[in-house]
């Protein structure tokens, strides 16, 4: 999504279909307050950003309220009146769902059902990753609602779990971002634990989209 008109790199993140964040990195203009102008409809006049992000005292991005909009964002980054980067992008291609909240665990013998509050929009995958101290890497299971049952767990082992949400690639495209992970919680024999004892340093979980 970068694009490099006059050496300007941009990044777009559409947080939870609520707020669009457009940030730029323009080494040529590093000490300049670039301005951000945008519209959601190709026929409208441009509005100027009212909520800038600052880095070292200079503009580096803009936050826009854009609740549940399946729109194209037309925007122009300018140095005074001179456009240094102009583009249009479908906002939903850069969706980042919010982190799962209210994660709940229901145990039944060697299985656990993990639930959380479903987000208000669809075409998402809810991924649970889990591991015991004896596992060399994280196991993963995902469903299209936040109701994921994992079977075949060893009742005597302590397991760490966390959950995230991903946008379906066939709906939103390949450039979305997974949500941040939920808190890690540790469980043994259906009881919560502060940590899983003798846990080796966990390998980094698979972060593939």
């Amino acid at each position: 999504q970068g694009g490099a008109a006059e050496g300007v790199q941009i990044q777009i993140i559409y947080f939870n279909l609520e707020t669009v964040q457009v940030t730029w990195n323009a080494s040529k203009y590093s000490r300049t307050n670039l301005t951000f102008h945008y519209r959601f409809n190709g026929d409208e006049a441009y509005d100027q950003c009212t909520n800038y992000l600052l880095q070292e005292g200079h503009t580096s991005g803009c936050l826009l309220d854009a609740e549940q909009r399946d729109d194209i964002l037309y925007f122009s980054i300018r140095n005074g009146t001179h456009p240094v980067f102009t583009a249009s992008r479908w906002m939903v291609y850069y969706l980042k769902p919010s982190s799962p909240k209210h994660v709940r665990f229901s145990w039944h013998q060697d299985a656990v059902t993990v639930t959380c509050s479903d987000l208000s929009y669809g075409d998402l995958l809810y991924e649970v990753q889990y591991r015991s101290p004896f596992d060399t890497e994280w196991q993963s299971k995902q469903e299209n609602t936040c109701n994921v049952t994992i079977e075949g767990l060893d009742a005597e082992k302590c397991y760490s779990f966390w959950v995230r949400v991903k946008a379906m690639e066939d709906v939103y495209g390949p450039d979305t971002y997974p949500s941040d992970w939920s808190e890690v919680t540790c469980w043994q024999r259906g009881e919560i634990r502060d940590a899983c004892a003798e846990t080796p340093t966990p390998p980094k979980p698979k972060l593939s989209k």
């Epitope: 947080f15 939870n16 919010s98 982190s99 909240k101 209210h102 229901s106 145990w107 919560i192």
Partner: antibody, heavy 121, light 107 residues
Framework: QVTLKESGPGILKPSQTLSLTCSFS??????????VGWIRQPSGKGLEWLAH???????YYNPSLKSQLTISKDTSRNQVFLKITSVDTADTATYYC?????????????WGQGTSVTVSS | DIVMTQAASSLSASLGDRVTISCRAS??????LNWYQQKPDGTVKLLIY???RLHSGVPSRFSGSGSGTDYSLTIRNLEQEDIATYFC?????????FGGGTKLEIK
């Protein structure tokens, strides 16, 4: 030291909008996993959970009041706000804000002292 | 909504007693049950979360237990400072709901 303090108008009339502020210190609402919520208690009665806002601006509302409630935050000023539109005498209560930290399974570990709100014509 | 019922709206006990306060949920809440103490001046404190986990700084004379729909808070060696109203709260499903409270009084 974690502290929360609620403030509000004290008295307002039916059909007006109630605006409450929770000012807190000792923690940041930008910390991952952190949340702040509102609970109310009519005099001599039980507690009713109203709304909750999270570090990433996710919001939860009690469905029975959702159409009346708006929760918001100003992370830099360590404040959380609750608006209740079209209040009635049934909204007369003490309003508390409370913190939900990481690791307590959605329990609220610190509460403010409460602010009393009376709705009367 | 899940209804939380505290059958006893008040209890009286003597200092030094062991007191048990019960709470029942209208459906299985998988131990997602918290206990709060409200002093007469309105101050609210978390005592126990997730059925039995003692919040930091809470005296060890407080303990919690239960599963499914039935839960209890036990206070051993009741002290004067424990005179308060105790509320249970389920956080298993939204909306989070509270019991009606049990007021603890000295005999």
């Amino acid at each position: 030291q974690v502290t929360l303090k609620e403030s509000g108008p004290g008295i307002l009339k039916p059909s007006q909008t109630l605006s409450l502020t929770c000012s807190f210190s000792g923690f940041s609402l930008s910390t991952s996993g952190m949340g702040v919520g509102w609970i109310r208690q009519p005099s001599g009665k039980g507690l009713e959970w109203l709304a909750h806002i999270w570090w990433d601006d996710d919001k939860y509302y009690n469905p029975s009041l959702k159409s009346q409630l708006t929760i918001s935050k100003d992370t830099s000023r360590n404040q959380v706000f609750l608006k209740i539109t079209s209040v009635d005498t049934a909204d007369t209560a003490t309003y508390y804000c409370s913190r939900r930290p990481r690791g307590t399974m959605d329990a609220m570990d610190y509460w403010g002292q409460g602010t009393s709100v009376t709705v009367s014509s | 909504d899940i209804v939380m019922t505290q059958a006893a709206s008040s209890l009286s006990a003597s200092l030094g007693d062991r007191v048990t306060i019960s709470c029942r949920a209208s459906q299985d809440i998988s131990k997602y049950l918290n206990w709060y103490q409200q002093k007469p001046d309105g101050t609210v404190k978390l005592l126990i979360y997730y059925t039995s986990r003692l919040h930091s700084g809470v005296p060890s004379r407080f303990s919690g237990s239960g599963s499914g729909t039935d839960y209890s808070l036990t206070i051993r060696n009741l002290e004067q400072e424990d005179i308060a109203t105790y509320f249970c709260q389920q956080v298993y499903t939204l909306p989070w709901t509270f019991g009606g409270g049990t007021k603890l009084e000295i005999k």
